[in-house]
Structures are given as C-alpha cells and as structure tokens.
C-alpha cells in the first residue's frame, strides 16, 4: 500500500536514510508512475539540465576563457525526463546538431551513461525517501535564505528549454545549509507528470507527488558553475514537493499564469520578479539532507539535495496547467520529465527531525535507524 | 524639461482603426519602459500597454482587453511611442494618456511622468 | 488579476483636516503600491510610491504607509488643492491594476 499523501504541515512521514539499497522495484517508477524511461546510476559529475539550466542552452558545457567571465546558468545543460518502468535506463536523446552534451530526452536513445558516463555513477539522484531509515541530525539547522523576495524590477527570464521551464534568478540570492556552507541561488525549474499522473523526482516511500521543485544554487567557494561540478557540496538543490490543495497558490500563478506564451519548445519570456522563498514550505526547519547528483545529463555529482519535509499546495487547475500548457521536443507534449528514483548505494539520508519516530503509518516491521554522520558539528 | 505629448485621436467607427503617437522629450528615451493607459468618461484607469526598454529588449506586454487588438511600438531614433489600435469597439472610448513607468534603476512599475492625453471616441 | 479596492469612494471633509484613504489589495504585494492625485480635466500625477515614498515635488502633509494587502494615503491637512481625486496602483505584476478612485469633496 502506498504511504499517504504528506500534508502541507505533516511530516513527510518521517525521514528516510539510506540502507544499502540494491536497485530495486521501489527505485524505479512504478508504471501509473513513470510511462518511460528512466537512467541508470552513474558516476562521474558533468552538469545536468535540471539542476542547471538548460542544456540546449548551450551545445557544449566548457569554461569560458578570462575574457569571456563566468559560465552563467543559461550556458550549462538542462535536465531531461524520464523513461518507460519497464527498462531501467534513462536514455538522452543526441539533438541533430547535437554535440555530446547538448539536448536531451526522457527516453531518447542512447542511454543517458553513454552521453554521460557520470549517469552510471553509484551515487545518483533522485532516491526514493524512506523517512523510517533517515538518521536524525541535530546538527542541521533550519536553511537560512537571504534576498529571495525579489521587487518586480528587473524582470526576470521564463524559459521552456524542452525539459522543464526555468526561471533565471539574479545574484544576490544567498542560501545557508549551515555554518560555513553557503550558496548562491541560480535558478529554478519544476518536474511533473500528466493527467492523472504524478511527476515527482523524488519519492517518498515510493510515492510520487505530482510535481517537484528544484532550486539549484552555486557553493560560494565556487566562482563558475563548471568548477563546481562535480566536486562535494559544489551545488546544492533545495527541492520540494507540490500537490493539491484547494486553493490557488499565488505565488506560484504569477509563473503558471505565463505558461502560454512560452507553449513552444525553446521560447522564454520575461515576468516580474517576485518572492522567491514563497515557492518554497514555509517549514525551513524540517528537511531530508543527501549527497546526490544532477538528474539528467551530465548527472554531475556531489550535488548536496535538500528535501523539504512540508509541501507546497497548489490548486487542481495549477497542477493541470502546468503539466498540460508545455511542448517539448519532437512535437510531442513536455509531460512525466522526471528520472527514475536511483539507488542509495549505501547512502544515509539524514533527516533535521526525528523523521523515522513516530510518523510512517507503514512502520510494520521494526527498522534500524541509521546515525547521524553529522553528530557533533 | 521631462515631457510627453500624444496626438493622433479622434473619432473611428466600430471595427476601424487609429494610430497614436507619444513624442518624448528630457529623458534618455531608450531607458524607460513605455506604457499607455487610458481612462474611459468619468471612469477610473485601465492599464492598456507596454514596451520594454533597451535593457529588456523592447518587447511589448499588453492587458488582455487589448491583446490581439492593439500593438504597441517604438521609434527610439525620434523618441516615439505608438500605439496602433484595430478593431475599435466603443468600449475602447477614452483618454489614451503616454506614460513613463520603470526603468534600469526601478524596482517596480511606478508612474511617474504623464502626458496630457488624446481622446479617442469610438462610435457610429 | 490583483483586484484593488479602495475605500471610501466619496470623503467628504473640510480645510484643515486630516484626511485617509484606505486601499486594499486582493494579495500579497509587499510595498509595490503607489498613489496618484488626479484633477478634472487632467492627467494623473505620482504622489507616492513604493507606499510610503514622497515623490519628487509633492508637498509634505501627504504621507502614505502599509504593506502586503493594506495600505493607507493620508493627507495631514487638506488644502484647497486637494479636492481631487485619488488612485492607487499596483506595480507587482502586470496588468497593473488601479482601485477605482476616491473622491475627496469639501464638506
């Protein structure tokens, strides 16, 4: 049976650690879940589209010389969709054109590992969440976000770069994990499904929400996003889940309201700036922590994911709007862009609450809780 | 001496068209957003368009009472804004005033420079 | 759309009073709002913006104050010249939207 749908102030019904987790029928979408196909692990860290931005933006993810500055967020490669349950693999799609890490398809061909070797790496993204085996970390404080409620001016960019739809945000936005481990927000952009379908990355228990956001943010040790990748806390991701609510999220309309005008594949606009942190659960003090990657190509790793414990409401009209108004590549319906949940391979997630206590309806068989890694900091 | 100045109203029957023209003067043209609102007899204000500036690439926003209908442009080499308006409906009856509104260094639209309006009567 | 409302739509008073005029908001918009004063016969003129900022030129017994999904313009003390009609604006996201005026006549 399937665990119920978390509240919007309800744990996400505990925390989850991750146990040595073999691949198996819970990481994988279930089929009402996923229609297509989904990547295996991988290994190395490259950018990947859905935590950058996107990467049709750009053919190929290279530095740019002194001259030129800084990659900026449109420049590295976008995150591509998921895969048919049956197989096990998330396949990108090589664009005609196509350079090796430019565009990318949930369930194109080849497969994701070899466009990307880093997307058959053993400590991939998303996992599924199992909050009866998160290690419960004291330590980890409640995310601190400075500069997230932006004025109407300057505009901001809205694109559909035939993965998600991305928001551009400009400097100034800082996030703190913790004590000395601070980022620099850059953009955003959503996953979800179809009718009746939910698209989540991320699961819980092996639930899937119906959509997910994902945050993505530069380490400020980092000047560029391609010295980052790769490397352990380079990028970190604060990613929630969005379902159904009565009510109109208005927050969120100011972006779905826009979703017409950028219908076709590669178009963006411009909307006002708006506060950031209000797409986001008011509950910063109650999170899930792993080390994860980027999921699509190039799958880069040592991205640090944050996954809120509340979720975000939005309205049943919202949720259709956003999983119905988009078009993505080959005149087909940008729908169920979503990775298959990846193994833990060992991973612990951990948990800021006593997520695994109390609070999982499934609790049948008595669990181990995993420790914290983090006790002591 | 910031300045604004329509011209180009006058009275159309239902389904033409009209073209109105702003001339902007005291200003660095080219940094603004450029917006038209109107105000119909004895009625409030109705946001109608705008233009972006350099900064934003000039693209146009319209209300949705409008879009499909009016187009909004301008001249940045003669410091010109227009507004060409078809398929008039008597609903569109009012004062078409010029306004500057945000620019490189605003934070949220504001208006802070009106010119005096021209009347457009749509009527049979 | 953000709807504005603005309240009362008539106020009638005298010279030399203190006057308010109240607008809200159908939601959030920080402090995004601005205030016009509009004469018969004439365009609008910017009196306040971003709620509580005097702009450039506008005498100093205007004051304007609130935010999120209330906010106020007060006149200290009403002059002649201020028989007029007032408007606040929405500048948060586009269509910018305006309340419907008040109407502020001598008593």
């Known amino acids: 049976q399937r665990l119920p749908r978390m509240q919007e102030d309800s744990p996400l019904g505990g925390g989850s650690s991750g146990e040595d987790d073999p691949l198996g029928e819970e990481d994988l979408p279930s089929e009402e879940d996923s229609p297509r196909e989904e990547d295996p692990p991988g290994e190395e860290d490259l950018p990947g589209e859905e935590d950058l931005p996107g990467e049709e933006d750009l053919p190929e993810v290279k530095p740019k010389s002194e001259e030129e500055g800084s990659l900026k967020l449109e420049d590295l490669p976008t995150v591509e969709a998921p895969g048919d349950p049956q197989e096990p693999q998330n396949n990108a799609h090589r664009d005609k054109e196509g350079d090796d890490q430019s565009h990318w398809r949930y369930g194109g061909d080849p497969p994701w590992p070899r466009v990307s070797p880093a997307c058959a790496g053993r400590f991939q993204s998303p996992v599924d969440i199992r909050p009866q085996l998160a290690a419960f970390c004291p330590a980890l404080r409640p995310l601190e976000l400075l500069g997230f409620q932006l004025p109407p001016l300057p505009e901001l960019r809205l694109r559909n770069n035939g993965h998600s739809v991305q928001l551009t945000l400009p400097p100034g936005l800082e996030m703190a994990l913790g004590p000395g481990r601070e980022y620099r927000a850059l953009q955003l952009h959503l996953h979800w499904g179809a009718a009746g379908r939910p698209g989540s990355e991320h699961t819980v228990e092996g639930h899937r929400f119906p959509a997910e956001i994902h945050v993505v943010h530069l380490s400020t040790a980092f000047a560029r996003v391609d010295e980052a990748l790769g490397r352990p806390g380079g990028l970190a991701v604060l990613a929630a889940f969005l379902e159904e609510g009565p009510e109109e999220n208005s927050a969120y309309e100011q972006l779905l309201s826009r979703l017409e005008e950028i219908a076709e594949e590669g178009s963006e606009t411009q909307v006002p700036g708006l506060d950031i942190s209000a797409l986001l659960p008011s509950d910063f003090s109650r999170y899930f922590q792993y080390e994860g990657s980027l999921t699509t190509p190039p799958c880069a790793q040592g991205v640090i994911w944050t996954v809120f414990n509340q979720t975000v409401m939005l309205s049943a009209k919202q949720l259709h709007t956003l999983s119905d108004t988009l078009w993505g590549p080959g005149d087909s319906r940008l729908q169920l862009n979503f990775r298959a949940t990846q193994p833990l391979n060992g991973r612990v997630i951990e948990a800021s609450f006593p997520a695994g206590v109390d609070s999982s309806p499934r609790a049948a068989e008595p669990v181990q809780l995993n420790s914290c890694l983090a006790a002591g900091d | 001496e910031v300045q604004l100045v329509e011209s180009g109203g006058g009275l159309v029957q239902p389904g033409g068209s009209l073209r109105l023209s702003c001339a902007a003067s005291?200003?660095?043209?080219?940094?603004?957003?450029m917006h038209w609102v109107r105000q119909a007899p004895g009625r409030g204000l109705e946001w109608v368009a705008f233009?972006?500036?350099?900064?934003?690439?000039?693209?146009?926003q319209y209300s949705a009472s409008v879009k499909g209908r009016f187009t909004i442009s301008r001249d940045n080499a003669e410091n010109s804004l227009y507004l060409q308006m078809n398929s008039l409906r008597a609903e569109d009856t009012a004062v078409y005033y010029c306004?500057?509104?945000?620019?490189?260094?605003?934070?949220?639209?504001?208006?802070?420079?009106w010119g005096k309006g021209t009347t457009v009567t749509v009527s049979s | 759309d953000i709807q504005m409302t603005q309240s009362p739509s008539t106020l009638s008073a005298s010279v030399g009073d203190r006057v308010t005029i109240t607008c809200h908001v159908s939601q959030n918009i920080n402090v995004w709002l601005s205030w016009y004063q509009q004469k018969p016969g004439n365009a609008p003129k910017l009196l306040i913006y971003?709620?509580?900022n005097l702009h450039t030129g506008v005498p100093s017994r205007f004051s304007g104050s609130g935010s999120g999904t209330e906010f106020t313009l007060t006149i200290g003390s009403l002059q002649p010249d201020d028989f007029v009609t007032y408007y606040c604006?929405?500048?948060?996201?586009?269509?910018?939207?305006f309340g419907q005026g008040t109407k502020v006549e001598i008593k």
């Open positions: 233009i972006r500036n350099k900064a934003s690439g000039y693209t146009p």
């Open positions: 005291g200003f660095t043209f080219t940094d603004y957003y």
């Open positions: 604006q929405q500048g948060q996201s586009y269509p910018f939207t």
């Open positions: 971003q709620a509580s």
């Open positions: 306004v500057r509104g945000g620019h490189a260094g605003s934070n949220y639209w504001y208006f802070d420079v």
